[in-house]
């Protein structure tokens, strides 16, 4: 079914990133545009993305509301400068999305070591705990905020002039580890939610060495 | 575990009225929309109404349209269906049914019986 | 409307029969048919969503297929209790409609 000349949106894909939500989805409009509808399971269609040309629509601001409901997204086409025109049906043609689930299905953006602090024989490694696009009482919660003790870090570590490498895991921002005094250490980290069967872990952070800028050294 | 129980079924003269209910539990009844599905005897299924979990959107097949109407009442987990000008053609049995996205119906209730007739 | 056509009306099969029951909308509906069983004097129950989504505590036994017009149900090794009436159902556009049921019954 469809008017004439217009194509159904196909490949329709959900990009995630710590909540941050793209639904992207082919063709690339020829004589046609698109309009995406978002709901939960309610029913309660939300248009967003009107009359658009693009491939894409960011529907960030739907998801964050409640990122534990699961949602469907639907793209309408139509056919450029005529969007009042309906197919044999009555009405546009459309596609769904895949079912989505943010909390279960976001992907985990890459963490960042914020600092790393010695005293003696310990480190002290502290990740940044990112901001997300959730809010709760007007503010932006962070990752551990939103994820609470689903969320857990794990520390990669290993001596400058080795190639051993150990780990070390945390329900915190932050890893105390026993390291050898006089040595200098690297470390990555990686965050995981190991109750998700998808988007379990992470890649791994950037690596930082002891002996650069993000370490402090007390004896 | 999902529970529906349709009431208020009944013989009713043609022309007269009748106002059927659901009651919902085992889920978050505002987070689904529900629909209304009958069954003339011996028949197969039609669907009649549906209804978005705020009761924004309503949906009605057109042999009811301006004789039914269907809500929910969300503080009290129950869905709704009142029944004017009731036809003949009207008498089967009405099952509630959960509807993720006002789509397809996951959960369904045991039925009751409406018969129209003098 | 949307007339949905379901073939055949009955069919006899034995258990342990691998089962193909045919479902076809008078024009496109993409993925959005759903499949319902139903037993006498009961209501009925959801067993595919998505043209070939399993509902959840469905037996794998049961599958579905198609995109478009034409859809299939089948029940790969019939069970004693598969003995039932089986619809389509299409949520592509309103008013939803159902096909008029195929009856599968013990040969």
């Known amino acids: 079914s469809g008017t004439t000349n217009t194509v159904a949106a196909y490949n329709l894909t959900w990009k995630s990133t710590n909540f941050k939500t793209i639904l992207e989805w082919e063709p690339k409009p020829v004589n046609q545009v698109y309009t995406v509808q978002i709901s939960t399971k309610s029913g309660d269609w939300k248009s967003k993305c009107f009359y658009t040309t693009d491939t894409e629509c960011d529907l960030t601001d739907e998801i964050v509301k409640d990122v534990k409901q699961t949602y469907l997204a639907r793209v309408f086409s139509y056919p450029a400068g005529n969007v009042e025109s309906t197919g044999s049906a009555g009405e546009p043609l459309y596609e769904n999305s895949p079912e989505f689930t943010p909390y279960l299905e976001t992907n985990l953006g890459q963490p960042t070591i914020q600092s790393f602090e010695q005293v003696g024989t310990k480190v002290n490694v502290t990740v940044e705990d990112e901001r997300t696009l959730v809010r709760r009482n007007n503010t932006f919660l962070s990752l551990r905020d939103v994820f609470g003790k689903d969320l857990i870090y794990t520390l990669y570590y290993w001596k400058d002039s080795s190639t051993g490498r150990k780990t070390n895991t945390t329900h915190t921002n932050e890893f105390l580890i026993d390291v050898d005094k006089g040595e200098n250490y690297c470390f990555s980290v990686q965050a995981v939610i190991p109750s998700r069967t998808v988007n379990r872990k992470s890649t791994d952070s950037p690596v930082e060495c002891m002996g650069q800028e993000k370490g402090e050294f007390r004896e | 575990e999902v529970q529906l129980l349709e009431s208020g079924g009944g013989l009713v003269q043609p022309g007269g009225s009748l106002r059927l209910s659901c009651a919902a539990s085992g889920f978050t009844f505002s987070n689904y929309a529900m629909s209304w599905v009958r069954q003339a005897p011996g028949k197969g299924l039609e669907w009649v109404s549906s209804?978005?979990?705020?009761?924004?959107?309503?949906y009605y097949t057109d042999s009811v349209k301006g004789r039914f109407t269907i809500s929910r009442d969300n503080s009290k987990n129950t869905l709704y269906l009142q029944m004017n000008s009731l036809r003949a053609e009207d008498t089967a049995v009405y099952y509630c049914?959960?509807?993720?996205?006002?789509?397809?119906?996951?959960?369904w209730g045991q039925g009751t019986l409406v018969t129209v007739s003098s | 409307d949307i007339q949905m056509t379901q073939s055949p009306p009955s069919l006899s099969a034995s258990a342990g029969d691998r089962v193909t029951i045919t479902c076809r909308a008078s024009q496109g509906i993409s993925s959005r048919l759903a499949w319902y069983q139903q037993k006498p004097e009961k209501a009925p129950k959801s067993l595919i969503y998505a043209a070939s989504s399993l509902q959840s505590g469905v037996p794998s036994r049961f599958s579905g297929s198609g995109s478009g017009t034409d859809f299939t149900l089948t029940i790969s090794s019939l069970q004693p209790e598969d003995f039932a009436t089986y619809y389509c159902?299409?949520?592509?556009?309103?008013?939803?409609?159902f096909g008029q049921g195929t009856k599968l019954e013990i040969k």
């Open positions: 159902q299409q949520y592509n556009s309103y008013p939803y409609t």
């Open positions: 209804i978005s979990g705020s009761g924004d959107y309503t």
């Open positions: 049914a959960r509807s993720p996205w006002g789509y397809y119906l996951d959960s």
